[in-house]
Interface confidence: low
């Protein structure tokens, strides 16, 4: 079966890292510099992504895989495959169309990206506030007053932080 398919389409035998060169009787030619083919049987190699300027190279391009970029200091990735770099703010801020703005009272952002999120409402879990929240940090919930009897555990560790959303563009 494989042999029959190969006779019908000689290009199917060209492995990743090569392309089927129509100009050379459909032989498998290596991808030229700064190009790649990640799968076999390709008739062209794709141009490598260039990580320039605000983008910096996280992984170099090879003949079988594209380059991967991240962002230079002061920026963070947005989109699939780091298709964009968005400017950072400071912890305790979020990026708005007016620039980096401090989180409103009752909200926090512990990263340089994303939006300010509301402090955890400890009372919803029947707990009390052990450590007050700030612009940069969520509140720490402690045990409810009823739990403070002798022998009870004194501190409940905070729940894991939720994944922050992206700031609006």
């Amino acid at each position: 079966f494989e042999r029959t398919r190969s006779l019908q389409d000689p290009c199917s035998n060209c492995p990743a890292g090569t392309f089927c060169d129509n100009n050379r009787n459909q032989i498998c030619s290596p991808c030229p510099p700064n190009s790649f083919s990640s799968a076999g049987g390709q008739r062209t190699c794709d141009i490598c992504r260039q990580c320039k300027g605000v983008f910096r190279t996280r992984k170099e391009c090879s003949s079988t895989s594209n380059a991967e970029c991240d962002c230079t200091p002061g920026f963070h990735c947005l989109g699939a495959g780091c298709s964009m770099c968005e400017q950072d703010c400071k912890q305790g801020q979020e990026l708005t169309k007016k620039g980096c703005k401090d989180c409103c009272f009752g909200t926090f952002n512990d990263q340089k990206r994303g939006i300010c999120r509301p402090w955890t409402n400890c009372s919803l879990d029947g707990k009390s506030v052990l450590v007050n929240g700030t612009k940069e940090r969520d509140v720490v919930c402690g045990p409810s007053p009823a739990d403070l009897s002798p022998g009870a555990s004194s501190v409940t560790p905070p729940a894991p932080a939720r994944e922050p959303g992206h700031s609006p563009q």
């Epitope: 300027g53 400017q87 950072d88 007016k98 620039g99 703005k101 340089k112 563009q169």
Partner: antibody, heavy 117, light 110 residues
Framework: EVQLVESGGGLVQPGPSLRLSCTAS????????MTWVRQAPGKGLEYIGF???????SYASSVKGRFTISRDDSKSIAYLQMNSLKTEDTAVYYC???????????WGQGTLVTVSS | DIQMTQSPSTLSASVGDRVTITCQSS????????LSWYQQKPGKAPKLLIY???DLASGVPSRFSGSGSGTEFTLTISSLQPDDFATYYC??????????FGGGTKVEIK
Amino acid sequence: EVQLVESGGGLVQPGPSLRLSCTASGFSLSHYWMTWVRQAPGKGLEYIGFINVGGDTSYASSVKGRFTISRDDSKSIAYLQMNSLKTEDTAVYYCGRGGLTFGWDLWGQGTLVTVSS
Amino acid sequence: DIQMTQSPSTLSASVGDRVTITCQSSQSVYSNSFLSWYQQKPGKAPKLLIYSASDLASGVPSRFSGSGSGTEFTLTISSLQPDDFATYYCAGVYSDNTYVFGGGTKVEIK
């Protein structure tokens, strides 16, 4: 009042250095990226560079290596340090606030730098 | 180097006219939309009119509008007012962090 005020311009000979200041009032400088642009007499606007909230900088190729942008958020001042001045650096220098994403939404009145022997 | 070409360089118009200024970049601006328009009057600082190609800056009259994507952009003044006679600049942001201004378009009274 929300404003930016540039200072430090004047007449200088070619070669020496000059530092321009951009003083912010009415808003928190630490929340904003800052830029410097210049305008030679009778010419258009030319981008010089920017500094982001974290202190990272980027410069136009025409000034890279000679000009340095810095900031002191505690004093609400952004600076433009200009070294090895040339006659072609003669221009009105403006500072602006904002960011690459959303444009520069507030500008100072400008300060004139004349480089002449 | 990236070139940002504005046309026309000078435009004579009358109050009430619809005015269109174009800006062409030699390469795509960052994210295809990071382009701003500024207005400048003699002896004054620039004023932001439009950002992200089409978003109106705070306090700017709605007669100003922007459009375009990639390498071609347009600033339109739907009905020219006496206060609009000025020089207009486009400025693009590119992936190497640079900000390039166009050469400017002077809108003068016909």
